[in-house]
């Protein structure tokens, strides 16, 4: 069974721009069964954006987004 | 307008490879990913692969991991798919289909054009 | 692998009918859910995108309903160029799946 942050969805690339942290409502991993590791920032309007996980900006969202959530992972 | 030119029909013997190309044209190639798709005969649509147009990343479903290889030429803004190994059931119609930007997480996966399809006939 | 069960097979209508097409995933899917129309000898076309988002150049007869298991495609007043296979294509997970197709057919 997948974990409870665990998304069933892949990644090709990772998004290069800026991560819209203040518009972003959830984030993800992607499947171990997936051919390249990534989070999956969830944005307000429903877009999934795939991000490196050892990207600097990328756990700086992770963070702000488990401070918003009093911590806890999002379901996916 | 957007178009995806694909290769002719293929004739080949069991055991052989064959290479199928699908060229985009009318819009940025690499914003894109491209995926291909099998139709056998009178069945439904079945996802090979995807693959990455700026990169040449590539997720394939499972069973065809082992058959078919994606390759893309950024130069020419074309796509490529390699069959080995054919057998009578790889004997299909094979779209290429454009997706989404690659950086969207595969839930936005659709395919809004579709190349006319490549007929890949095996015989002996 | 999520399965996508289309239903009717086979649908025989008259020029003029409403008619709805179904499509059943056999897990949750949101609404990660395309529709698409296929011609004899022709490449497939997209219809619908998400369940009900409409696509520019479809025409208006044709809306999607559903959410998570349960998805309708609604043609309103079937015309000729409308006959041909309709399937159904998830995108939640991994690897990405179509339905088996309901043949739109001349009553």
């Known amino acids: 069974a997948r974990g409870t942050n665990v998304g069933r969805e892949c990644c090709l690339e990772y998004f290069k721009g800026a991560i819209p942290i203040s518009r972003l409502t959830r984030w993800y991993k992607t499947s171990g069964e997936c051919p390249k590791d990534a989070i999956v920032f969830v944005t307000v309007q429903g877009k999934s954006i795939c991000s490196d996980p050892k990207d600097k900006r990328v756990k700086k969202a992770v963070r702000y987004l488990q401070r918003t959530w009093k911590g806890g992972p999002q379901e996916s | 307008q957007v178009q995806l030119q694909q290769s002719g029909p293929e004739v080949v013997r069991p055991g052989v490879s064959v290479k199928i190309s699908c060229k985009g044209s009318g819009y940025t190639f690499t914003d894109y990913a491209m995926h291909w798709v099998k139709q056998s005969h009178a069945k439904s649509p079945e996802w090979i692969g995807v693959i990455s147009t700026n990169s040449g990343n590539a997720i394939y479903k499972q069973k065809f991991k082992d058959k078919a290889t994606m390759t893309v030429d950024k130069s020419s803004s074309t796509a490529y798919m390699e069959l080995a190994r054919l057998t009578s059931e790889d004997s299909a119609i094979y779209y290429c289909?454009?997706?989404?930007?690659?950086?969207?997480?595969?839930?936005?996966?659709?395919?809004?054009?579709w190349g006319a399809g490549t007929t890949v006939t095996v015989s002996s | 692998d999520i399965v996508l069960t289309q239903s009717p097979a086979t649908l025989s209508v008259t020029p003029g009918d409403s008619v709805s097409l179904s499509c059943r995933a056999s897990q949750s899917i949101s609404n990660n859910l395309h529709w698409y129309q296929q011609k004899s000898h022709e490449s497939p076309r997209l219809l619908i995108k998400y369940t009900s988002q409409s696509i520019s150049g479809i025409p208006s007869r044709f809306s999607g309903s559903g959410s998570g298991t349960d998805f309708t495609l609604s043609i309103n007043s079937v015309e000729t160029e409308d006959f041909g296979m309709y399937f159904c294509q998830q995108s939640d997970s991994w690897p990405l799946t179509f339905g088996a197709g309901t043949k739109l057919e001349l009553k």
């Open positions: 289909a454009r997706g989404r930007p690659d950086y969207y997480g595969s839930s936005h996966w659709y395919f809004d054009v």
